[in-house]
Interface confidence: medium
């Protein structure tokens, strides 16, 4: 999933079907001048940042998984 | 491209131990998580467990734990299974299977290696 | 763990014709099933993820539906090629659990 780094929407496109497991964090970036939409930008194991649909119930479900770990720690 | 190139056939006596490999080559190595997956005779298939390289993390099925021990090695690209206290009910041919970056599913997959014990 | 109840265990079917094979998950998994092929002598190949989306190379023949803990996986317009045993796979809890395989034949 194509993500770029300037001061626009960075989300070209989402990826379908992201496991938690390979999900290291998670930024949601809210509606702004850069960008009209909501987007989740997430940053895998290995590094690398993947772009998540936020309307996904299963990516909402991740993003409250990965949330109440990092205030659990 | 991606190729998992696994160790020959082994015909080990019970109570012995045994170690196959699987080289990967044509990606990052590191990067992916590797499993083990089990199939004995006449049989399906059963999720032993996995390895990331890049920082030696494990995650295993509770039937296997103690029975298999996972290891991987960077320099070379290979990851290993150590398969111990051998009985006949680990004859049975081994799978490693690369898991995507991100979703997890299983692409690729070696050819699998058959591991017979007996005395 | 989570257990995946794949049916039927065999069947067979014609050359040109559908097949469906079931899983059914013991609790939600989320869509979290793919489906394999796997052929006597060989690894097993990845052909659907994520329960509908094909894997690059695989034929639109194949597809998948579900939701839930109910799925499904069809070939139409079978080929001598597609005899194989097909295995589902859920990931969406550890430890990831197959279902028991279908072993495919053609009539």
């Known amino acids: 999933a194509s993500v770029v780094t300037e001061l626009r929407c960075q989300c070209l496109q989402t990826l379908q079907g992201i496991h938690l497991k390979n999900i290291q964090s998670v930024n949601v970036r809210s509606p702004g001048p850069h960008c009209a939409q909501t987007e989740v930008i997430a940053t895998l194991k290995n590094g690398k940042k993947a772009c998540l649909n936020p309307a996904s119930p299963m990516v909402q479900k991740i993003i409250e998984k990965i949330l109440n770990k990092g205030s659990t720690n | 491209q991606v190729q998992l190139q696994q160790s020959g056939a082994e015909l080990v006596r019970p109570g012995s131990s045994v170690k196959i490999s699987c080289k990967a080559s044509?990606?990052?190595?590191?990067?992916?998580?590797m499993n083990w997956v089990k199939q004995r005779p006449g049989q399906g298939l059963e999720w032993i467990g996995q390895?990331?390289?890049?920082?030696?993390?494990?995650n295993y099925n509770g039937k296997f734990k103690g029975k298999g021990t996972l290891t991987a090695d960077k320099s070379s690209s290979t990851a290993y299974m150590q398969l111990n206290s051998l009985t006949s009910e680990d004859s049975a041919v081994y799978f490693c299977?690369?898991?995507?970056?991100?979703?997890?599913?299983?692409?690729?997959w070696g050819q699998g290696t058959s591991v017979t014990v007996s005395s | 763990d989570i257990q995946m109840t794949q049916s039927p265990s065999s069947l067979s079917a014609s050359l040109g014709g559908k097949v469906t094979i079931t899983c059914k998950a013991s609790?939600?998994?989320?869509?979290?099933i793919a489906w394999f092929q796997h052929k006597p002598g060989k690894g097993p190949r990845l052909v659907i993820h994520y329960t509908s989306i094909l894997q690059p190379g695989i034929p639109s023949r194949f597809s998948g539906v579900g939701s839930g803990r109910d799925y499904s996986f069809s070939i139409r317009n079978l080929e001598p090629e597609d005899i194989a045993t097909y295995y589902c796979l859920q990931y969406d809890n550890l430890p990831w659990t197959f279902g028991g395989g279908t072993k495919l034949e053609i009539k």
């Open positions: 044509g990606y990052a190595f590191s990067d992916y998580w």
């Open positions: 390895i990331y390289p890049g920082d030696g993390d494990t």
């Open positions: 609790q939600d998994i989320n869509k979290y």
């Open positions: 299977a690369r898991e995507r970056d991100y979703d997890v599913a299983m692409d690729y």
